[in-house]
Amino acid sequence: IWELKKDVYVVELDWYPDAPGEMVVLTCDTPEEDGITWTLDQSGEVLGSGKTLTIQVKEFGDAGQYTCHKGGEALSHSLLLLHKKEDGIWSTDVLKDQKEPKNKTFLRCEAKNYSGRFTCWWLTTISTDLTFSVKSSRGSSNPQGVTCGAVTLSAERVRGDNKEYEYSVECQEDSACPAAEERLPIEVMVDAIHKLKYENYTSSFFIRDIIKPDPPKNLQLKPLKNSRQVEVSWEYPDTWSTPHSYFSLTFCIQVQGKSKREKKDRIFTDKTSATVICRKNASFSVQAQDRYYSSSWSEWASVPCS
Amino acid sequence: VPGGSSPAWAQCQQLSQKLCTLAWSAHPLVGHMDLREEGDEETTNDVPHIQCGDGCDPQGLRDNSQFCLQRIRQGLIFYEKLLGSDIFTGEPSLLPDSPVGQLHASLLGLSQLLQPEGHHWETQQIPSPSPSQPWQRLLLRFKILRSLQAFVAVAARVFAHGAATLSP
């Protein structure tokens, strides 16, 4: 058993049929010695008396808010949550496996630039009695500070018969150094509590590996005189790190016909303009990636040819 | 470069960008690792990193690029030695057209651009001993190539910025 926060305790249980469970001793936080009784949750049933209460925690029915009373007045509370371990593996019932980029990916994180700011998100099908808290640091043995904001419900989607909820959090490294080569990874730890179930999820990454630029902005087409060719231009997204002479992007451009089956030629360039043949009904698209490190490509930015 | 002269920024830019391409072709990003790559924090602490105080940011380069160039050169020589060591020459053997061979040559080429013959800067000692099992060797190769990718990305940014803003 360990303390998650004041008056909230997590009991770690090996979860299998007829498991013996954990013996837990609760102590009433009071100078009083006599006339103390204990109850669980809203039930008025007295579980025991005295300054301490010894219980055997085996299942969710044994978890909950234990209260010690004297003379009808509550003296202190202890909330017991359960953390299940099945076959040596901690349970992951609350969050959905996003399976990208690999199996057992429960937290996904992205950064738009090298400023040390990043966003993490996760999915669940649970809609009520659910709370999250997030901690983050750079490195774990000698951690450096990362500050995370409040967790927000960022999206709701219907997937077949189920509703899926996306939660996200924004974090900022306290002393980011955008130009340096990261030596220690960022660690993100999410505590999830659903009713009386406690779970924790972690992710470890370098900012450089989670970079995903915003799409290029300000796409423009300029037809060339007496030619089927068009000069296309675009700009770095506003959110990308500066100066651009240092934090450079590379671009992938393509012209897509009306039919998705039509062959599309992709051209790679470090420039912010190109000359292409842009037929009527087609569209021109461009995406960006860090020029020197193969992190994610941005989403496509598109503009119709006509 | 030693003693404060400027490097051939444009040449360094070209070669460092080539290094980035080679480093990624030698170890592309894949969704899952077939051998567990992630070790504890200490695994790549013995390779040189370009750190915050090394003057490799745009402001530091403007003030005095020498600190940063020395750091980059130390790293290049360190990785060049690693790529020539039995970590890479042992089983499983590199084939004649291995990108590691090209990487090795390019690391040497860029380090020489930064230090013409006759000047010698301090370089870090290469760690030893190297692993005896092929699977340990593979793991170490992947770690080295991953950290090399991060190192040459910073070096390439430095040379791109230098070529754009510091060239005479």
Partner: nanobody, 121 residues
Amino acid sequence: EVQLVESGGGLVQPGGSLRLSCAASVSIWSFKVMGWYRQVPGKQRELVATITTGGSPDYADSVKGRFTMSRDYDKRTVFLEMDSVKPEDAAVYYCNGRLWAHLTSSGHDVWGQGTRVTVSS
């Protein structure tokens, strides 16, 4: 040039067993993934079993529980143990290896020439 050479094919009765071998010209640590595929004339080549470096084998549903893929690092060889063979297992069996990217700039995918398995009573 890296080569894979299969052997061990031949005639087998339904319910019988056969052991296919695939010998590599380089250490099998050189391969990120090795696999056995099979092809029947007029049909696409289908995956039978694969094994990643340091991993355990994965099998196609049709052969699970009957076929076993293994490797011998010292002999630079991978094997396909075929038990409880069925008529539908008759095909040309190919060995495949995908080389680690750092070992070569070209031809990451290496194929053997194939070995024929005939199932007949």
